[in-house]
Interface confidence: low
């Protein structure tokens, strides 16, 4: 589409007479009628076929035509056209004597010509006007002309469409050749693609307008480039989206089972030894004056049994005090005053002399202890016993009495709970301090997984485009990490419109 | 298992500023996957969504209460705040705090709801 | 901002009947982003349905989710005594998020 422009400059009719030779009367007030039509050889009459227009009267026999085009008038003359401009023309210029105002061709006579003109040739769209004068016998034109391309239109035939546009469907500016020069931050062929943020991950973002980088599911941060672990990861971290690799000392499926219970939260009050055992399992050795599976019952000093010799201890405010049977004495009742004379050693114990006589010692047979063999051995002082287990006499020999879920001699061992196999379907048992936690396969659920459900969400393939599947072990479902150019729940859409809420 | 309790008084004053907490366990907020909303719904109608606060906090508002609205977040103490000032009897409501995952703004969990009454 | 128009306002249906509930956008919801709650009285809506047809977990399979563009629908093949209650659609493809005004479905 363009426009084929018509410049009228001076039209001289010195002596004012029409074509016919006769004279206009008063004088030849004189108008222009214009025909443009396709390349011919010879201009013969026929239809307009690029168009035709007229002029008012512009001036009487002599005159020059004023550039009207800035005041919105008539010159230069404009004839229209939508099609692709073919590069050649025929044009026709008839000066007319118009004696009244009616100018239509019926109204006027037939010898009311003045002059006629026709021209033919190549003509190529540009700025540049092309100056021409054509002279008869009796008058002379003066008129320059040009094809320029209508606003939007562009290239040597106005045959490219091409109109600057900032909005969905494109943001670009038209060169002078017609083809687009996208606006900064745009790329594309129709600079529908926004630049995103410099460094936003090319897999992970996307953008919907520039500088822009918006994470795709299972992705955060300013580019993009860091994973989100799993829903209700605790202490873990990830290399792809809803991962949960564990940090040191975390174990179970959402890193959230303490395998260091004992650095992570010292249990053990008193000053007391934390021993880790496990899941989320410890064992404190207690000082002495304590007891307790944490350690944090205090003892009263008397039960450590601190009197020797057959003491009896007594509470004081301010600690214990030992009441010495006779012939002993001293804080703990741990000196004598007897010696072998006076058959110090009870149960069978043998007396041996010391410090020339000043002082003796008993030595005592099996099962009995004391300084004087007093006391039946106690096999449980040693507190041997580990993981809370009660230790309980035995004549001779002691036995420990395990808390549920320890066995040994000293229930030092730990019973699994997953020694009987209890998860169905093929799933993973995890011993646990109060017992035990299956993690199921695919397709299975429960606390023992022997309930079936739902497949793995990803086995059905329901991402397009060679898109990733992630299955969303929380909520049972999957997510599809699309591939550069795809949008959707499953990457099924192409990339089109941006989306509206860029979120 | 995630939940989410809202606490706050449950009478405000109009011309006073309304101020709720969501206190959320069983799951962390500091989560970057997770975007954490209030909601509303007047007596006997429908629900609004008010806005949400992400634990970067980045905050997006409903555009009609915009002008009145804070919301914000301390990840350590696993809560998340709404402020609502200048209030009407128009926001006589009950307020709901809830989950939704990032980029996809659906509610999978959401607070058991407190009312809030404006009268004087 | 995206306008939600669910209908009937209300349903008066029977144990075992079949319900369908329609979700009317005054725009295209992209990329299908509609969820549904089902809400019963004095508790929070729980979500059913995302991204128009995806089941929430834990949610029964009579309950179906369908449509996109501005249709949409929540079909209840048969249903049960528990079900009875209003339900609600919620776009979030389009800013400020926005739900429907509700259906509820009572027994007949």
């Known amino acids: 589409s363009g426009v084929f422009q018509l410049q009228l400059q001076e039209f001289i009719n010195e002596r004012g007479v029409l074509a016919s030779g006769r004279p206009c009367e008063p004088g030849c007030r004189t108008f222009f009628r214009v025909c443009l039509k396709h390349f011919q050889a010879v201009v013969s009459p026929g239809p307009c076929t690029f168009g035709t227009v007229s002029t008012p009267v512009l001036g009487t026999n002599s005159f020059a035509v004023r550039d009207d085009s800035s005041g919105g008038g008539r010159n230069p003359l404009q004839l229209p056209f939508n099609f692709t401009w073919p590069g050649t023309f025929s044009l026709i210029i008839e000066a007319w004597h118009a004696p009244g105002d009616d100018l239509r061709p019926e109204a006027l006579p037939p010898d009311a010509l003045i002059s006629k003109i026709a021209i033919q040739g190549s003509l190529a769209v540009g700025q540049n006007w092309l100056l021409d004068e054509q002279t008869s016998t009796l008058t002379r034109l003066r008129y320059s002309y040009r094809v320029i391309c209508s606003d939007n239109y562009y290239g040597d035939n106005c045959s490219r469409l091409c109109k600057k546009r900032n909005d969905h469907f494109g943001h670009y500016v038209c060169q002078p050749d017609g083809n687009l020069s996208c606006l900064p931050g745009w790329t594309g062929e129709y600079c529908q693609q926004p630049i995103c943020l410099s460094g936003c991950h090319e897999q992970n973002g996307y953008c919907s307008k520039p500088a822009e980088c918006l994470c795709r599911p299972g992705w955060q941060g300013r580019l993009c480039n860091e994973c989100i672990p799993h829903n209700g990861c605790r202490h873990g971290t990830c290399s792809t989206p809803w991962q949960c690799t564990c940090d040191e000392g975390w174990g179970g499926l959402f890193c959230d089972q303490d395998l260091n219970y004992c650095t992570h939260h010292s249990p053990c009050k008193n000053g007391a030894t934390c021993s880790n055992s496990g899941q989320r399992s410890y064992t404190c050795t207690c000082r002495p004056g304590y007891t307790g599976v944490d350690c944090e019952l205090e003892l009263s000093e008397c039960d450590s049994n601190p009197c020797r010799n057959g003491g009896s201890c007594k509470d004081q405010e301010d600690g214990y005090h030992c009441l010495c049977p006779p012939g002993y004495y001293g804080l703990h009742c741990e000196h004598s005053t007897l010696s072998c004379a006076d058959s110090p050693c009870f149960n069978g114990g043998s007396c041996r002399e010391r410090n020339q006589g000043a002082n003796y010692a008993c030595e005592c047979p099996p099962n009995f202890t004391g300084s004087n063999c007093e006391k039946k051995v106690d096999r449980c002082t040693s507190n041997p016993c580990a993981n809370g287990g009660q230790c309980l006499n035995r004549g001779p020999s002691r036995m420990c009495r395990c808390r549920p879920g320890f066995t040994g001699t000293y229930c030092e061992l730990h019973v699994s709970d997953c020694a009987r196999n209890p998860c169905a379907h093929g799933g993973t048992c995890h011993d646990l301090e109060n017992g035990l936690m299956c993690t199921c396969p695919a397709g299975f659920s429960g606390r023992r997984c022997e309930v079936r459900t739902s497949i793995d969400a990803c086995a059905s393939s329901p991402c397009f485009n060679r898109a990733t599947c992630y299955t969303d072990l929380s909520t049972d479902t999957f997510v599809c990490n699309c591939p550069y150019g795809f949008v959707g729940s499953r990457c099924e859409f192409p990339v089109g419109l941006p989306p509206s809420f860029p979120w | 298992q995630v939940q989410l309790q809202e606490s706050g008084p449950g009478l405000v004053k109009p011309s006073q500023t309304l101020s709720l907490t969501c206190t959320v366990s069983?799951?962390?907020?500091?989560?970057?996957?997770?975007?954490w909303s209030w909601i509303r719904q007047h007596p006997g109608k429908g629900l609004e969504w008010i806005g949400y606060v992400h634990y970067s906090g980045n905050t997006h508002y409903n555009p009609s209460l915009k002008s009145r609205l804070s919301i914000s977040i301390d990840t350590s103490k696993i809560q998340f705040s709404l402020k609502l000032s200048s209030v009407t009897a128009a926001d006589t409501a009950v307020y709901y705090c809830?989950?939704?995952?990032?980029?996809?703004?659906?509610?999978?969990?959401w607070g058991q709801g407190t009312l809030v009454t404006v009268s004087s | 901002e995206i306008v939600l128009t669910q209908s009937p306002g209300t349903l008066s249906l029977s144990p075992g009947e079949r319900a369908t509930l329609s979700c009317r956008a005054s725009?295209?919801?992209?990329?299908?982003?509609l969820a549904w709650y089902q809400q019963k009285p004095g508790q929070a809506p729980r979500l059913l349905i995302f991204?128009?047809?995806s089941r929430a977990t834990g949610i029964p399979d009579r309950f179906s989710g369908s449509g996109s563009g501005t249709d949409f629908t929540l079909t209840i093949s048969r249903l049960e005594p528990e079900d009875f209650a209003v339900y609600y659609c919620q776009q979030y493809g389009s800013s400020p998020l926005t739900f429907g005004g509700g259906t509820k479905v009572e027994i007949k």
């Open positions: 725009q295209s919801v992209s990329s299908s982003y």
């Open positions: 069983g799951g962390s907020i500091g989560s970057g996957g997770y975007y």
């Open positions: 991204g128009a047809s």
């Open positions: 809830a989950r939704a995952p990032r980029g996809y703004h659906y509610f999978a969990y």
